[in-house]
Amino acid sequence: SSPCPQAWGPPGVQYGQPGRSVKLCCPGVTAGDPVSWFRDGEPKLLQGPDSGLGHELVLAQADSTDEGTYICQTLDGALGGTVTLQLGYPPARPVVSCQAADYENFSCTWSPSQISGLPTRYLTSYRKKTVLGADSQRRSPSTGPWPCPQDPLGAARCVVHGAEFWSQYRINVTEVNPLGASTRLLDVSLQSILRPDPPQGLRVESVPGYPRRLHASWTYPASWRRQPHFLLKFRLQYRPAQHPAWSTVEPIGLEEVITDAVAGLPHAVRVSARDFLDAGTWSAWSPEAWGTPSTGPLQDEIPDWSQGHGQQLEAVVAQEDSPAPARPSLQPDPRPLDHRDPLEQHHHHHHHH
């Protein structure tokens, strides 16, 4: 059997780190057998059989010029094997970012914090940590770990389905290459990483006879499974064309009547969503929808100054208009369980007011 341990990676390739001493191993001989070493295609002897190093070639302070293929020969001139040297770095801890677009699934993406230059793979797993009672900071025994299934298309992403909203999860992403492994552990809770998708189906319509009104309506994002304990609240922004500043209102329900529109001007409107008890963060803004107030016959208006920025329609779906039911009362202490950092969103949206 070969005296050379096979590192993870393609066969026949051995690995080292720039600036460090590198040992190459002749694969086709017995351990300790003296061999001669040559660069492939070059007659110059690099290291003879009398070096005292047996089946190994030592390269002091390897650099990029040392990369390539080497040939080792036994004393009788037989081929001991060929070895390709590739230089790179051991893994550094990867950077991990997790996000949830709903209250029962989340995904984590990762990126190397340094490109190693070597064949690299990632091992991804997670385990659940549960808290024993509302006032307790003690943890129950860990459950898992389970694999975090990676995207089949090779994207650096894995998805946890069926997560529990009140549980804390520890994500383990380990970067592995032939020179070692390095792990990032990250504790996440759905509450902190929840960021809904933007509302969908935004429509902006004029209100006949009201030259300063616009009626906006929208729907829940398709990714959000509606349940009484997990509703969304919304934020709506609008501005007349060519106006730099947005006006902001927080509608009740899935529609809003804007009462201080500028007569005759098209208005841009956009909406954002957030868990109704303020878990996580606001969604990205929906694509803008445009509408222009009606120019038809004038109706009697309540003076705009008395109405503020907006007025809700009466005919809002009852579920949206009635007080929201409370979530289950046995909630864990919302403070973080330990020091692992809360996770970043990939994109940061700048809200203009």
């Epitope: 801890r93 990126s111 190397p112 914090s113 340094q114 490109i115 390095s182």
Partner: antibody, heavy 118, light 107 residues
């Protein structure tokens, strides 16, 4: 030799914007995580933001989240920090820093001064 | 976020003195700790990484120790060029944080 050279600092009014640049040389820029650290006058060092080699993940201090954007152009060996809605408390010397082998901020530039004042 | 504390906040010492600075993390950071020296108008310089490893080119009079939450930085024999402000920094999390600094000046 690793070299990092910041530019783009200056005087700006509260609410204004500024873009800092950091030109990198002496190493393969596209392989390394990079970041920004600042020091306000008479204060200590404060980490501001980091970005992975591909640019695909960015991380921010709470004090700048939503106002600052870190980015990089690997073809130009340049790191950027776009600073919007600037406040007086953002006044500081801003340093560009390189991470190495998972160790944060092993190499630093000389810094560029940003003054936010009316 | 993890808070870092340092003591003392300042000290006066003479050339040749042994100087010790301590750093404490609000939570366990294993050994993910750096020590820097920062002089006015210059870039901070990394001296120690991973709590106890000497950065290449840094004199052996500097050393670091500790793990978990408590860390120590030592200069065995203070030299004129060692005066300045020393910072510890944790990088266990994706949000690194610095200690408030210890200013070392000439007695």
């Amino acid at each position: 030799e690793v070299q990092l050279l910041e530019s783009g600092g200056g005087l700006v009014q509260p609410g204004g914007s500024l873009r800092l640049s950091c030109a990198a040389s002496g190493f393969t820029f596209s392989r390394y995580m990079m970041g920004w650290v600042r020091q306000a006058p008479g204060k200590g060092l404060e980490w501001v933001s980091s970005i992975v080699p591909s640019g695909g993940i960015t991380i921010y201090a709470d004090s700048v989240k939503g106002r600052f954007t870190i980015s990089r152009d690997n073809s130009k060996n340049t790191l950027y920090l776009q600073m919007n809605s600037l406040r007086a408390e953002d006044t500081a010397v801003y340093y560009c820093a390189r991470d190495h082998m998972g160790i944060v901020a092993t190499d630093w530039g000389q810094g560029t001064l940003v003054t936010v004042s009316s | 976020d993890i808070q870092m504390t340092q003591s003392p906040s300042s000290l006066s010492a003479s050339v040749g003195d042994r100087v010790t600075i301590t750093c404490q993390a609000s939570q366990d950071i294993t050994n993910y700790l750096n020590w820097y020296l920062h002089k006015p108008g210059k870039a901070p310089k990394l001296l120690i990484y991973d709590a106890s490893n000497l950065q290449t080119g840094v004199p052996s009079r500097f050393s670091g120790s500790g793990s978990g939450t408590d860390f120590t930085f030592t200069i065995t024999s203070l030299q004129p060029e060692d005066f300045g402000t020393y910072y510890c920094q944790q990088y266990d999390t994706l949000h690194p944080s610095f200690g408030p600094g210890t200013t070392v000046d000439i007695k």
